[in-house]
């Protein structure tokens, strides 16, 4: 079964701690129709003349997932738990299309970084997505921030179009992803 949430409009500002900018280059708040033009929902359901979405309010739909760009600062672990409380997980990037979509979203926040669902226990152990799946560097490279002072950056965030490792305790924003099945 799938919950159908009515799409709401927001502004390109913070609302309840969430970044509501959509997928337009000038980052102006699109109408629902312009949102459809830029990020086509795969299967939006119309009910009583109102376009409904399989995503909750304030979440952005792209292909088969809903995304929430949280603008509350948290450690990686705190961000993971915040996503869990919303019935989702930290972002897992599955394709180059999805990566492009995410880069487009976060590029409008050039001063901010966003945790994604990739971590490892220590440098000798491979990166692991939050769901336990393997990480393949074919999709993207992780640029290291390791220094002698901070030798163990074991969590991953995205900043504009670059993905970096980072100390897991550093407070940052985050991206939650909720996959839906039709």
């Amino acid at each position: 079964t799938m919950a159908i949430w009515r799409s709401n409009s927001g502004s390109n500002t913070l609302e309840n701690g969430y970044f509501l900018s959509r997928n337009k280059e000038n980052h102006s708040q699109p109408t629902q129709s312009s949102l459809e033009d830029s990020v086509t929902p795969t299967k939006a359901v119309k009910t009583t003349g109102v376009l409904s979405s399989p995503c909750p309010p304030n979440w952005i739909i792209y292909e088969k997932s809903c995304y929430l760009f949280s603008m509350s600062l948290n450690s990686w672990d705190g961000s993971k738990r915040q996503c869990w409380q919303l019935g989702s997980n930290l972002l897992k990037i599955d394709s180059s299309n999805e990566l492009g979509f995410i880069v487009k979203q976060v590029s409008s926040q050039p001063d901010n970084s966003f945790w994604i669902g990739l971590s490892r226990p220590q440098t000798e152990v491979p990166w692991l997505w939050e769901d336990g799946s393997t990480f393949s560097s074919n999709l993207f490279q992780i640029r290291t921030t390791a220094t002698q002072e901070n030798p163990s950056p074991n969590c991953v965030w995205i900043h504009v179009s670059v993905i970096y490792d980072q100390l897991c305790s550093v407070p940052s924003y985050s991206i939650c992803e909720k996959k839906f099945s039709m």
Epitope: V125, D131, T134
Partner: antibody
Amino acid sequence: QVQLVQSGAEVKKPGASVKVSCKSSGYTFTDYYIHWVRQAPGQGLEWMGWINPNSGDTNYAQKFQGRITMTRDTSISTAYLELSRLRSDDTAVFYCARNSGSYSFGYWGCGTLVTVSS
Amino acid sequence: DIQMTQSPSSVSASVGDRVTITCRASQGISSWLAWYQQKPGKCPKLLIFGASSLQSGVPSRFSGSGSGTDFTLTVSSLQPEDFATYYCQQAYSFPFTFGPGTKVDIE
């Protein structure tokens, strides 16, 4: 649903080799590490190593180095464990398990009993 | 290798009891710890991962806590199906290692 189905029990002589299979279904085989864990009769659990089914990369526990080989056949979503130069103290149930969050083992095969006896 | 120790090695308890099992790592493992339940002749079942995250489908009477070297598995109200052996496992460094197990049996 996720399922791991293992091959049947084996009886081997000391010095021989054994190859155990683990067929996966219900998920994308190449997306998750497969671990092998053994349990001697009445004993605890012992991690032997893993294979990344996508790349074929392996990581073996040091104590098994030189006589353990993990392989996979992605066309039939099956992982294999081969243990050579068997000794009587290798008698154990061998489990395959699929990786889950935080490198835990979320799904297990039902085990393959390997008996090493002369 | 990281050594994992568990205490007690066995515990006798009754239905409805609160049972606590502890696991200690020989060095810090952050939160990279899992708990499993195993019944005789059966394969292990994941209960807790990441030290405190409940695996999907596991009853909420199971909970995990701890970080670093000291961890706890708690069963808030023991049920008949909970009599089993419980293992902790570290996933911080290779080789991954298990504790020796704690057997929970009927008092």
